[in-house]
Amino acid sequence: TPEVWVQVQMEATELSSFTVHCGFLGPGSISLVTVSWGGPDGAGGTKLAVLHPELGTRQWAPARQARWETQSSISLALEDSGASSPFANTTFCCKFASFPEGSWESCGSLPPSSDPGLSAPPTPVPILRAD
C-alpha cells in the first residue's frame, strides 16, 4: 500500500522559518502534489502550494518556495511574517496524486518540544482517503 510521509522542521538560523518535507512511498508516477495547512486539502485546510512535474509549481503566502527534491518528494519553505497563525501549532498536509494508485494524503506538525533544526519523525499520519 502506498504511503505518504510528512516532516516539519524549524530552521535553526531563522525561528520564523519552517520547511515542510513530503514524500510518496509506492509505485507509480506522481501527477500532482498539493500542500495545505490547518487540515487536509478539501477538508478545511488552506492550500499552500501545488506542484506538477511538467506544469511547474505555485505557492501562496506564507509559503515562499516549493520545489521537487526527488521524483517522489517535495519541500516547501514557509516564512511566518506574523500575518497568519503560528506554524508551531499548525498541521501541514501533503496529498500526492499518482497514476494508477489515486490520491494519498498524510499530515504532520512540528513536535511540541522541537528545538530549531530538529524535525518531526517521518511517520505518516495517514488520512484514509484514496480518490
Epitope: T46, R58, W60, R64
Partner: antibody, heavy 119, light 106 residues
C-alpha cells in the same frame, strides 16, 4: 464554464459601508482562491487581498488591512468584500478574480462592480 | 513588498507592426510574472503566465520572456483590437501589478 458574477453598481455616502458580492459557478468554489482587485478611474490595477473559500483563510495587501473584509458563503458559492469608512478615494471599479493555480493567477474575472462614494 | 516598474506608460504603433513592453521587479521574482490585456468597460484578460506560457486561446503573436528582475512582453503583427492597456503582475511574493501601458494602434 467558469463564471464569476458580481453585484450591481453602488452609490453610497462617505463614512458608510458597502458589501460587494461575487457569485461563482462552473467549478469547485472551495478549491480555488478568490482575489479582489481595485481600479480607480484613469488609474491602474491594485490587488486588495485574497480568500481561500475552503477554509475562509484570508491575506490582505497592507494598504487595505482594516478597510476591507473578505468573506465567503460556501452554500451559495459566493464571495463578498465589505469596505467600511468609505471616502471618495474608494470610488472605483472592483473586480473579483479566481486564481487559476497552475493555469496562472486571475484566469477568470467578474465583470466588475462600480462603487461611487458621494454625498 | 515587491515593486513592479512598467514601461513605457503609453505607446503608439502601426497596424502590422510590433511592440515590446518591459517590467522590472524590485527583486528576483523567479519568473512568476503574468501579463493582462484590459479594455475600457471590460474585465482584464490573462494572456501569459509564468513569463512565457500562453493562456489557452491566446494567439501566438503574443509572447513573453525574461528572468530574475527583468521581463518583457511583445505583440507582433498588431491588429486594431490590440488597442488596450496592458499590465504585468508579479505573483512570486503576494501580488503586485505594474503601472500599465496604454497601447494605441495607428
Amino acid at each position: 464554464q467558469v463564471h464569476l458574477h458580481q453585484s450591481g453598481p453602488e452609490l453610497v455616502k462617505p463614512g458608510a459601508s458597502v458589501k460587494i458580492s461575487c457569485k461563482a459557478s462552473g467549478y469547485t468554489f472551495t478549491a480555488y482562491y478568490i482575489n479582489w482587485v481595485k481600479q480607480r478611474p484613469g488609474q491602474g490595477l491594485e490587488w486588495i487581498g485574497w480568500i481561500f473559500p475552503g477554509s475562509d483563510s484570508t491575506y490582505y495587501n497592507e494598504k487595505f488591512k482594516g478597510r476591507a473584509t473578505l468573506t465567503v458563503d460556501k452554500s451559495s458559492s459566493t464571495a463578498y468584500m465589505l469596505l467600511n469608512s468609505l471616502t471618495s478615494e474608494d470610488s472605483a471599479v472592483y473586480f473579483c478574480a479566481r486564481d487559476g493555480e497552475l493555469r496562472g493567477p486571475f484566469d477568470y474575472w467578474g465583470q466588475g462592480t462600480t462603487l461611487t462614494v458621494s454625498s | 513588498d515587491i515593486q513592479m516598474t512598467q514601461s513605457p506608460s503609453s505607446l503608439s504603433a502601426s497596424l502590422g507592426g510590433k511592440v515590446t513592453i518591459t517590467c522590472k521587479a524590485s527583486q528576483d521574482i523567479n519568473k512568476y510574472i503574468a501579463w493582462y490585456q484590459h479594455k475600457p468597460g471590460k474585465s482584464p484578460r490573462l494572456l501569459i503566465h509564468y513569463t512565457s506560457t500562453l493562456q489557452a486561446g491566446i494567439p501566438s503573436r503574443f509572447s513573453g520572456s525574461g528572468s530574475g528582475r527583468d521581463y518583457s512582453f511583445s505583440i507582433s503583427n498588431l491588429e486594431p483590437e490590440d488597442s488596450a492597456t496592458y499590465y504585468c503582475l508579479q505573483y512570486d511574493n503576494l501580488l503586485t501589478f505594474g503601472g500599465g501601458t496604454k497601447l494605441e494602434i495607428k
